[in-house]
């Protein structure tokens, strides 16, 4: 479809104007420096070669500078989201420039037009960066472009047009359709900027994916497995992307991107940690909470630069809103022994006491299965700092809640109507912190009682060696 | 000082169209974005929809987007809204308000139109 | 759409003493708040935006609080002239809509 824009990327506005004697060219993109926290004030419409707006608005040449990119949209309005980014940096950084690129006249089109525009609007702010560093003490390592959906690209496309090497990309759930499986020339990538950090909120292996899945930057953080976000509801619906409409659903996982980033900003003293891990599902298993070698990083804003060799995949659980940050912990349960337990899994639930506080009653996911003669690790959050954990109540859940777990239990007594109780044991459960990399021993009450049966509880308290720290490093970073 | 001034009171027969003007005075006209709020008799205030002056960008509240058509004149600094098959229940005060740089707040509004549907 | 609900429909309070104004919305809204004030007759005046944001011309006794679900408008000193209907509104998610307004009156 024709695309509507001329090589210099501007804009024939025609709407509701009958006569051709009556157009008016006007930038389809421009820049509006954003002077003031302030939602009223004007700011400073920048334009390269004219240096008067730099000095109007006090343009700092030695300061960071922030590009705010926003996405595709089916409105001629801004969507809120951009004030709050616009006001936590404002908050956070308060000698920044703070950019707001507005390409609205492109971006209100078809979602396929709108791709399409990407890469002249990218031209735009790689022209205005490179009439930036005309200018004395400019410098484009202090550049941070942060775009959201399907300006994530754009700011790819600005990162590789730009003469130079942009500090840094962030991009928020970068736009998935069109953008899947590309070239690195076409979609945002690691070679865009010295940095390029991405959070992945709305991802599906399955329908449309709104987000992009493949990893796209030196790191790519997967919050909550990069699917369902907590909070956002109806999460088996599939929101349709049909020219003008949008379920709240869709806008609330995609728009979480942003939301954490702006968490990061102003709630620095409570930041969340992402851990490297190969896929969701191990990360799910508890598997993936080491520190070492850079494996963990704060993610948003506070993200330490890391350039990897190959794509780094992290993920973290959240909370449903802000502060996001939630704690993580590995448990690791040796089952030595276990009679009788036909085809269910069991359903076990874990509480945590702590000095600080204690934890809700927090299920254990089975992954895959409970092995016997074997160490099961599992993944735990908790949305309060218990301290120095005390000690751990485990429960197995006795009357099954779910239907597919009856009817197996059902077959399993027509198999063996005489089954005796089902029990396992447990001797001991390890505990690592992500948040601290501290690692734990809990040990049996009743060293004589180990075992566990349905509808029954375990108690585990510290074991007499107490916390050991194993070289492993914190997460805690330090802030930009 | 900014200044909205709307045009002034119409009485329409059920069915009909109502188109109501609001001139901007006193800033940038398309730098800022313009929304249509409009109050029945003791009633809530309720937003109709909002166009960015720059390029003619348009949101609609989803209840009125069949029968609502807001436009702009930029050379006029004139905002436009347009209310058609109107019935006795649109018989309201319709204001123009300015919205802030995000559109969010209004912290200009035009003086009212009031608009009787009667037959 | 995002249901702004104002408990009180109308508040009495005497002249000099403290006005409080609730607001609820009925999901998440940030700071993504902002009160108007309309007497009859009148457009609506804005009085706080984003929930705490002061603007320049209003008096310094109205003030703004909330974040989240829960908002309120504090008048710490009720003049003659404040006694008048408040709305409040949200733009968080598109359609923007308001309370149902409380009338504030003279006790």
């Known amino acids: 479809s024709p695309v509507p824009f001329g090589p210099e990327g501007r804009l024939e506005d025609k709407l509701h104007k009958p006569k051709a004697t009556q157009t008016e060219v006007k930038p389809s993109v421009r820049f509006n420096l954003r002077t003031s926290k302030d939602p009223e004030h004007e700011g400073c419409y920048l334009s390269v070669g004219h240096s008067q707006p730099l000095e109007d608005c006090s343009f700092n040449m030695t300061a960071k500078t922030f590009f705010i990119i926003h996405g595709w949209t089916m409105s001629g309005i801004f969507e809120n989201w951009l004030h709050k980014l616009v006001s936590a940096l404002h908050t956070r950084e308060k000698d920044a420039n703070v950019v707001v690129v507005d390409w609205l006249p492109l971006a209100h089109q078809l979602y396929t037009d709108a791709v399409n525009n990407t890469r002249v609007v990218g031209h735009s702010i790689a022209r205005m960066l490179d009439w930036l560093q005309e200018k004395d003490d400019f410098s484009l390592g202090n550049v941070h472009l942060i775009g959201y959906s399907l300006g994530a690209h754009v700011a790819g496309y600005a990162g590789n047009f730009v003469k130079g090497t942009v500090g840094r990309i962030t991009g928020l759930d970068p736009a998935g359709p069109m953008f899947e499986g590309a070239d690195i020339h076409k979609r945002l990538s690691p070679d865009d900027a010295d940095f390029v950090d991405v959070l992945h909120t709305y991802t599906r292996s399955f329908g449309l994916s709104i987000g992009i899945q493949m990893p796209v930057g030196h790191i790519d953080i997967y919050p909550n497995g990069g699917d369902f976000q907590p909070g956002c509801g109806l999460n088996d619906v599939l929101g349709s992307i049909a020219y003008g409409t949008i379920t709240e659903v869709v806008k609330c996982e995609h728009e979480r991107a942003v939301h954490l980033f702006v968490d990061s900003l102003v709630n620095q003293d409570k930041p969340s940690f992402a851990f490297q891990c190969t896929d969701s599902n191990r990360f799910k298993k508890g598997i993936c909470l080491s520190c070492r070698k850079n494996r963990c990083n704060s993610i948003g804003y506070n993200a330490k630069k890391m350039r990897n060799k190959r794509n780094s995949k992290m993920y973290l659980k959240t909370r449903a809103g802000m502060p996001f940050r939630v704690y993580h912990y590995q448990m690791k349960i040796h089952v030595f022994s276990y009679k009788n337990m036909g085809e269910i899994e069991p359903t076990f639930y874990v509480t945590l006491y702590g000095t600080n506080a204690d934890s809700q009653t927090l299920p254990l996911e089975i992954v895959e299965r409970i092995e016997q003669n074997a160490t099961n690790t599992f993944l735990v959050y908790t949305e309060e700092d218990l301290g120095d954990l005390l000690k751990i109540q485990l429960t197995w859940e006795g009357a099954s809640q779910s239907w597919y777990n009856l009817w197996k239990e059902f077959r399993s007594y027509l198999s063996q109507p005489r089954n005796p109780g089902r029990e396992l044991n447990i001797r001991r459960i390890r505990v690592k912190s992500g948040e601290t990399q501290r690692k734990l021993t809990f040990c049996t009450e009743d060293p004589e009682n180990t075992s566990i049966s349905p509808g029954r509880e375990l108690w585990f308290r510290k074991c007499r060696d107490g916390w050991r720290m194993k070289n492993e490093t914190s997460p805690t970073v330090e802030l930009p | 000082q900014v200044q909205l001034v709307q045009s002034g009171a119409e009485v329409k027969k059920p069915g009909a169209s109502v188109k109501v003007s609001c001139k901007a005075s006193g800033y940038t006209f398309t730098d800022y974005t313009m929304h249509w709020v409009r109050q029945a008799p003791g009633q809530r205030l309720e937003w109709m929809g909002g166009?960015?002056?720059?390029?003619?960008?348009?949101t609609y509240n989803e209840k009125f987007k069949d029968r609502v058509t807001i436009t702009r004149d930029t050379s006029a600094s004139t905002a436009y809204m347009e209310l058609s098959s109107l019935r006795s229940e649109d018989t309201a005060v319709y204001y123009c308000?300015?919205?802030?740089?995000?559109?969010?707040?209004?912290?200009?509004w035009g003086q009212g139109t009031t608009v009787t549907v009667s037959s | 759409e995002i249901v702004m609900t104002q408990s009180l429909a109308t508040l009495s309070v005497s002249p000099g003493e403290r006005a409080t104004l609730s607001c609820r919305a009925s999901?998440?809204?940030?700071?993504?708040l902002h009160w108007y004030q309309q007497k009859p007759g009148q457009a609506p005046r804005l009085l706080i935006k984003?929930?705490?944001q002061s603007i320049s011309g209003i008096p310094a006794r109205f003030s703004g609080s909330g974040s989240g679900t829960e908002f309120t408008l504090t008048i710490s000193s009720l003049q003659s002239e404040d006694f008048a209907v408040y709305y409040c509104q949200q733009s968080n998610s598109w359609p923007y809509t308001f309370g149902q307004g409380t009338k504030l009156e003279i006790k």
């Open positions: 308000a300015k919205g802030d740089y995000y559109g969010g707040s209004y912290n200009y």
């Open positions: 984003y929930a705490s």
């Open positions: 166009i960015n002056p720059y390029y003619g960008g348009t």
């Open positions: 999901q998440d809204i940030s700071n993504s």
